[in-house]
Interface confidence: low
């Protein structure tokens, strides 16, 4: 895999005029060194709220029992190894995948300090050659492992307990001015390694970021529990060159992959090879016919394959992305020897089908053609192949430049972290977050609806058998009817024999309502997976409707909207679960069930098990989320 | 082609164990978890659980918890059920079957069964 | 659990007609519902996942359908392969469940 970068590529198609001798800085400015760089900001919301959520005061508790905090910065070895070639004492070669076994082996090196963070707000972990060797490879004979992780226990810890402010994490490049784009090779090994934060935090039990498969099990309402996070990139990970487009003309390692992988000049086997024109001279291999010496000849080096059968070779752009409908693929190859191949460009989105992309040649001078297709904009990140397939025994191809033009307008989109969440059951089954505290057993022992659900402040996690937990209703007069909170005991709810919040709509002269609130739940982070989830059940003839309103203090202001709502209905006496998605709130808000009803009615309107669900604080949706599919998923 | 192979036809007595086997070939083994189904005329289909080849991390349905023990062996491609104290009420066709990961949750190929008869 | 019912246990259709079979959830599955074909001699194969996405090599003639609790598998054009008794699956909750099947025999 050449993955290296160049920056300072040729300027202009070698089809027009003649080109610029290529060119690379030793070094980059701070702003390139910065695009070399992977961010990771975690939000200072999800601090507060990880605390407030599921940190008690350390004084209510024995130290013994409270939740512990770990963090670690994880990276695949496999592309950090191929930078490097092989490596004495490494026990797989650096081309092939790392055996089954390494998928669960890692060394830890060390994180940044807390001192350091409070300093500079921001942690800096600086990867090179040597701690690459030192966390993949370790001593000489031992076996290469499939993770190099940073231990950043120590940092998240104190973080999460008395930091303030968000926690920045850059990991990038270590800086050594030496040898030409070993930085930004550097840099596409790091996005190539699917660099992730991985988060946990455990109450008394757990004890590692590993998988907790053999652990005793301790009884339901033992206050153990453990939440993972990990924080990605949403998309595989964006070359920094989808900010400014790409283009290689192979004078100095690029940011592209090859399939056979890129050979050095001394391997006469059969894939893609740079050579410099000077020695294609020598080699005559340019000479297509007509073809004239000249001093408009490409200089620098370009990409041969020599093949001997029917084959299929490659040439695979890093991840892209595209905010121009003018995006292009440009493509540089030598037209005498197209004959007995051709090249067929295809665009890879992310998570969709592959599709061809057309190509249209133009010709240009001494036997090149620029072969130039549109991509557009699609909607995901994208990769281009390019796939050159021989026909005969005995095939040559030349590339001189391979580029992505015009794909962007201003600054991309860039690309989004995502913070995901799982709870870990005690036989090592895991959860996505939110089947945690919704009233449904998901874990084999039911620990995801344990004690830490009940522990949640007031109203996130209620079946109403301690009371009305945070529910008010206004100042009432002695004969309006009112939500209770009470058994449904009767012959057809053997099912349901504990409490739920009821109003009874009994007959009445003129129209009545009734407002029941809950108490004020924070603000949901931005680019949460929200959720409201509750039980309903309307026993009888309602005339009249019961409705479920959002309120969010707004600066002040209360702005209310309808959520949910039911009218005029003849009861199943079933219990229906639903799921609302709450979307685009940003500010604190409240529930208001509100009941309407007028002459005739006889009905009980119930509502019990409500939660909020965990990610609305604690999970962060890569995308933002996109205001469509929020009807309430219902079930009985 | 994909395949999973299963074992013969068992005939047990009450209060004993049975393992049976299910060899994967065509695919790579670890790729997939492997689910077992137990068909009656009486309860027709039911989950039993399912095993992740790669870490031999498990998940049964609570019914079965403790009647049917689960493992893997990575190196022959092999997965087993070991049923415990048998009686009448486990004689079934017993299914096992495979389910991607990163796909929906559905289960794409399926063994060819093994009958156990539970009987003195 | 969620029970998984198929109300018709058997039906009768002629070659070439179009058949509907049904399935219904105790509670909103949000279509993680997926659709399997026994044939006499035990051989299970899955047709339809996620309600509605036809798994490789199925005739285009199989289609699924539906929401919330209610779904449905519909064979546009049956013919004599298609006999075979036909199980719904849901995926939302553990455990995964079947429903009771319904065998489709030939008039």
């Known amino acids: 895999v050449g993955s290296g970068m160049g920056t300072g590529q040729r300027a202009g198609s070698p089809a027009a005029g003649p080109p610029l001798q290529p060119r690379e800085p030793l070094s980059y400015s701070r702003l390139q060194r910065k695009s070399l760089a992977v961010d990771f900001v975690v939000p200072s919301l999800f601090r507060v709220y990880a605390r407030d959520l599921l940190l008690p005061p350390s004084s209510s508790e024995l130290k013994a029992g409270r939740p512990e905090a770990r963090g670690s910065l994880a990276l695949d070895c496999a592309p950090l190894l191929r930078l490097l070639g092989p490596a004495p004492g490494v026990s797989w070669t650096a081309g092939s995948p790392a055996p089954a076994e390494a998928r669960t082996l890692s060394r830890v090196l060390k994180g940044g300090s807390v001192r350091k963070l409070r300093r500079a707000k921001q942690l800096v972990l600086e990867l090179g050659e040597e701690a690459i060797l030192e966390g993949c490879v370790g001593p000489p004979g031992e076996a290469a492992v499939g993770l190099l992780q940073f231990n950043l226990s120590e940092l998240f810890s104190w973080w999460i307990r008395q930091g303030e402010g968000r926690l920045r994490i850059r990991l990038m490049p270590e800086k050594k001015a030496s040898e030409v784009g070993r930085e930004g090779r550097l840099s596409a090994a790091i996005r190539a390694s699917q660099p992730r934060l991985l988060f946990q935090i455990f109450g008394t039990g757990h004890s590692s970021l590993e998988s907790p498969t053999n652990m005793p099990s301790p009884s339901p309402d033992y206050f153990t529990w453990n939440l993972t996070w990990i924080m990605k990139d949403s998309f595989p990970f964006l070359s920094h060159r989808s900010r400014y487009g790409l283009e290689c003309s192979f004078d100095f390692p690029c940011e592209l992959e090859y399939s056979p992988p890129l050979h050095d000049l001394r391997n006469q086997s059969w894939s893609w090879r740079r050579i410099p024109s000077e020695e294609a001279s020598q080699m005559d291999l340019l000479d297509g016919p007509g073809a004239e010496r000249s001093k408009e000849m490409p200089r620098g080096s370009f990409l041969l394959l020599n093949t001997s059968a029917d084959s299929k070779h490659t040439i695979l752009s890093p991840w892209m992305r595209s905010s121009s409908e003018h995006c292009t693929l440009a493509v540089s190859v030598h037209r005498h020897l197209q004959p007995s191949g051709r090249y067929i460009a295809q665009l890879l989105p992310h998570n969709e089908a592959a599709r061809e992309i057309l190509l249209m040649p133009t010709p240009g001078k001494h036997g090149w053609t620029v072969l130039q297709g549109r991509i557009g904009r699609p909607d995901n990140p994208f990769r281009v192949a390019l796939e050159y397939i021989s026909s005969g025994n005995r095939s040559l191809s030349a590339v001189d430049f391979f580029a992505l033009k015009n794909c962007s307008e201003g600054t991309s989109p860039g690309s989004k972290m995502a913070l995901q969440s799982s709870f870990t059951c005690w036989n090592g089954t895991v959860l996505q977050l939110g089947q945690a505290c919704d009233f449904h057993q998901d874990c084999a022992q039911g620990e995801d609806e344990s004690q830490m659900c009940r522990k949640l402040p007031v109203g996130f996690y209620c079946n109403f058998e301690d009371g009305f937990c945070g529910w008010t209703q206004g100042t009432l007069s002695p004969h309006t009817p009112q939500w209770q909170v009470r058994t449904l005991k009767d012959a057809r709810f053997q099912d349901h024999q504990d409490h739920a919040l009821l109003l009874s709509t009994t007959d009445v002269p003129a129209s009545e309502s009734a407002t029941v609130t809950s108490a004020t739940f924070p603000a949901p982070i931005k680019s949460s997976p929200c959720e409201l989830r509750m039980s309903w059940l309307i026993r009888g003839v309602l005339r009249g409707n019961v409705s479920l309103v959002l309120v969010e203090n707004k600066t002040g202001k209360e702005q209310g909207r309808m959520v949910w709502h039911v009218a005029a209905y003849e009861g199943l006496s079933l219990w229906q679960w639903m799921v609302l998605p709450l979307l685009d709130v940003s500010d604190r808000f409240w529930l208001q069930m509100v009941a309407w009803w007028g002459q005739g009615s006889r009905a009980i309107v119930a509502f019990d098990n409500i939660s909020i669900s965990l990610d609305c604080y604690l999970t962060i949706s890569g995308e933002d989320k996109i205001l469509q599919n929020t009807a309430p998923k219902s079930r009985n | 082609q994909v395949q999973l192979q299963q074992s013969g036809a068992e005939l047990v007595r009450p209060g004993a164990s049975v393992t049976l086997s299910c060899k994967a070939s065509?695919?790579?083994?670890?790729?997939?978890?492997i689910h077992w189904m137990k068909q009656t005329p009486v309860h027709g289909l039911e989950w039993i659980g399912t095993i992740d080849p790669e870490t031999g991390g498990t998940a049964y349905n609570q019914k079965f918890k403790g009647k049917a023990i689960l493992t893997a062996d990575k190196s022959s491609s092999t997965a087993y059920m070991e049923l415990r104290s048998l009686t009448s009420e486990d004689s079934a066709v017993y299914y096992c079957?495979?389910?991607?990961?990163?796909?929906?949750?559905?289960?794409?190929?399926w063994g060819t069964g093994t009958t156990v008869t539970v009987s003195s | 659990d969620i029970q998984m019912t198929q109300t018709t246990s058997s039906l009768s259709a002629s070659l070439g007609d179009r058949v509907t079979i049904s399935c219904s959830a105790s509670q909103g599955i949000s279509n993680y519902l997926n659709w399997y074909q026994q044939k006499p001699d035990g051989t299970v194969k899955l047709l339809i996942y996620?309600?509605?996405s036809l798994h490789s090599g199925v005739p285009s003639r199989f289609s699924g359908s539906g929401s919330g609790t209610d779904y449905s598998l519909t064979i546009s054009n049956l013919e004599l392969e298609d006999i075979a008794t036909y199980y719904c699956q849901q995926y939302s909750k553990v455990p995964r469940t079947f429903g009771g099947g319904t065998k489709l025999e030939i008039k």
């Open positions: 996620y309600t509605s």
């Open positions: 079957t495979r389910c991607y990961y990163g796909s929906s949750w559905y289960f794409d190929v």
């Open positions: 065509g695919y790579t083994f670890t790729d997939y978890e």
